[in-house]
Amino acid sequence: HTAAQDNCTCPTNKMTVCSPDGPGGRCQCRALGSGMAVDCSTLTSKCLLLKARMSAPKNARTLVRPSEHALVDNDGLYDPDCDPEGRFKARQCNQTSVCWCVNSVGVRRTDKGDLSLRCDELVRTHHILIDLRHRPTAGAFNHSDLDAELRRLFRERYRLHPKFVAAVHYEQPTIQIELRQNTSQKAAGDVDIGDAAYYFERDIKGESLFQGRGGLDLRVRGEPLQVERTLIYYLDEIPPKFSMKRLTA
């Protein structure tokens, strides 16, 4: 190939360094922060994305704390340990030797402890509830149109198989998207619901991880759907283990 074509880019991950040095001059990309090779035909794992984000730190976000067993990402950003496949390691520790266990989306699911803390397995997050509130519109969106557009979005943009979008609920102005994916359902090559939800979250915030994107342009029958707040709840296959002290705080 010519010198003019000696650049390549990763459509699914801005936070990469790429060069066409793969077989047959195919584009090969590595994630910032970890240096791990990423597959640009699909989504990059949330763990590698967080690691890349921490290599170019920005202001940490603050998230709302819900009740019950559903987890949200209260701890904000951290520099995670990822396994060779790019998944979160079950135990995460910070630089002051404070450790905790996380689920497959990297959200803390135990109290914090010290280096003696054991996390026997990476517990899978099998149900994600994305709770959105849209800005006021002249009228409510048609539910079936909204459902179809969101399912299209998750299939085409986030590469998530339609069977993992369990439901789209709508009571103006609240939209809820339910993603479900058990360990037994996830085949090789399937996008993880946690990764799809993370890409969606970043898109909604105007921090798109895709090349050439600032944020998400979402329309239902030509009418812009503008999200004014987002909450994401994570449900694990095994309930989290927090002390009563935290639960009553």
Epitope: Q5, D6, C8, P11, P20, C40, R152, E156, R157, Y158
Partner: nanobody
Framework: QLQLVESGGGLVQPGGSLKLSCAAS????????IGWFRQAPGKEREGVSC????????YYADSVKGRFTISRDNAKRTVNLQMNSLKPEDTAVYYC???????????????????WGQGTQVTVSS
């Protein structure tokens, strides 16, 4: 930034053929979903065809099905639109676009495509 360049347009008689090519100057099109669109005078831009990045699946508008073929030429780093049995109603400016989508379909909105070319004129006339 991807800068897309279309080539291959021109004047052709009804029933004739043309092959349009889409290339990205300075970049490969690996992993990008590529769509072809056209805009006839006084009409809105419409989707013609696309090829998905995830599995290479293709979509064609009903008006071109069986006559147009979209393909990737990895050696030349292009995405081509082979247009056969051209009709006067195929006259339009043809654009290619690249999107960070995994899949494309009839219902993929044009705003899902991130980068657009300047277009190449196709005129079908006797």
């Amino acid at each position: 930034q991807l800068q897309l360049v279309e080539s291959g347009g021109g004047l052709v008689q009804p029933g004739g053929s043309l092959k349009l090519s889409c290339a990205a100057s300075g970049f490969t099109l690996d992993y990008w979903t590529i769509g072809w669109f056209r805009q006839a005078p006084g009409k809105e831009r419409e989707g013609v065809s696309c090829i998905s990045s995830s599995d290479g699946s293709t979509y064609y508008a009903d008006s071109v099905k069986g006559r147009f073929t979209i393909s990737r030429d990895n050696a030349k780093r292009t995405v081509n639109l082979q247009m056969n049995s051209l009709k006067p109603e195929d006259t339009a400016v043809y654009y290619c676009a690249a999107g960070s989508l995994g899949y494309c379909s009839r219902s993929t909105p044009q705003y899902e495509y991130d980068f657009w070319g300047q277009g190449t004129q196709v005129t079908v006339s006797s």
